[in-house]
């Protein structure tokens, strides 16, 4: 069983798995960037059966899942910033 804890380092994942989880079993994916006292990026998969799994960010299958989320979150066209010249 993979566990998610708040540890002294503030990392939430004690163990990470590379084992593939079919998409139909995934409810949501939480991506925690390194920081806040945790030296590594963490990926937490919340499954439909309410269990929680920490996944190795380097696992190939999770990369595609993350791309879906990144694609969606980046889908607003950046507004160009025009600097006004001061006479």
């Amino acid at each position: 069983v993979l566990e998610v804890y708040y540890t002294s380092l503030r990392c939430r994942c004690v163990q990470e798995s590379s084992v593939f989880i079919p998409r139909r079993f995934i409810d949501r994916i939480q991506i925690l960037p390194r920081g806040n006292g945790c030296p590594r990026k963490e990926i937490i998969v919340w499954k439909k059966n309410k269990s929680i799994v920490c996944v190795d960010p380097q696992a190939e299958w999770i990369q595609r899942m993350m791309e879906v989320l990144r694609k969606r979150s980046s889908s607003t066209l950046p507004v160009p910033v025009f600097k006004r010249k001061i006479p």
Epitope: I29, R64, E67, K71
Partner: antibody, heavy 119, light 112 residues
């Protein structure tokens, strides 16, 4: 194999509301990364994206039409719906629904349903 | 909005020869995650569009290897190495990087 099929009223009068249904099989909108979108094509012209909806109910609309569009889904029935309020003759077109699978946008399409707006 | 401009509008070709279609976007369609969601579709007469190429250069399943996509930033190209009769129809480029998603105006591939 994946199939999608659109259904609609065929003919409407100006100012009426268009209700479209997309019924699909061999995939589920309860699966992470899945979505369904709507695209239309006036006869002899190009394609215009209207809206799409994701597995987690996040919705995106074409800003040019957003005030008139409503997209929704019934995951258990494998259906997605699009409503277009206050139709005009400019809305006369073939309306397609299509699947989104992760970063494949619109990988499978329905056959289309034709709408004519006429008084 | 990102405007997608295709050239030529019409492309007469002889069977067995190469065809090339250009698509230019009004803004870069490279997302800040580094990916470019540029796709190519073929709409055969009387049919729905079908996906050929995704993410600039990746062939969708079942698409013959005579179809290839290339490009970056704002300039993209679809090449058909040896045109066959079943390739005739209207080709559309499409960007799914930024909302509103937009299609090119289409290029009609026809027999010379």
């Amino acid at each position: 194999q994946v199939t999608l099929k659109e259904s609609g009223p065929g003919i409407l009068q100006p100012s009426q509301t268009l209700s479209l249904t997309c019924s699909f099989s061999e995939f589920s909108l309860s699966v992470f990364g899945m979505g369904v979108g709507w695209i239309r094509q006036p006869s002899g012209k190009g394609l215009e994206w209207l809206a799409h909806i994701w597995w987690d109910d996040e919705k995106y609309y074409n800003p040019a039409l957003k005030s008139r569009l409503t997209i929704s889904k019934d995951t258990s029935k494998n259906q997605v719906f699009l409503k277009i309020a206050n139709v005009d003759t400019a809305d006369t077109a073939t309306y397609y629904c299509a699947r989104i699978d992760g970063y494949y946008d619109f990988d499978y399409w329905g056959q289309g349903t034709t709408l004519t707006v006429s008084s | 909005d990102v405007l997608m401009t295709q050239t030529p509008l019409s492309l007469p070709v002889s069977l067995g020869t190469q065809a090339s279609i250009s698509c230019r976007s009004s803004h870069s369609i490279v997302q800040d995650n580094g990916n470019t969601y540029l796709q190519w579709y073929l709409q055969k007469p009387g049919q729905s569009p079908q996906l050929l190429i995704y993410k600039v250069s990746n062939r969708f399943s079942g698409v013959p290897d005579r179809f290839s996509g290339s490009g970056s930033g704002t300039d993209f190209t679809l090449k058909i190495s040896r045109v066959e009769a079943e390739d005739l129809g209207v080709y559309y480029c499409f960007q799914g990087s930024y909302v509103p998603y937009t299609f090119g105006g289409g290029t009609k591939l026809e027999i010379k």
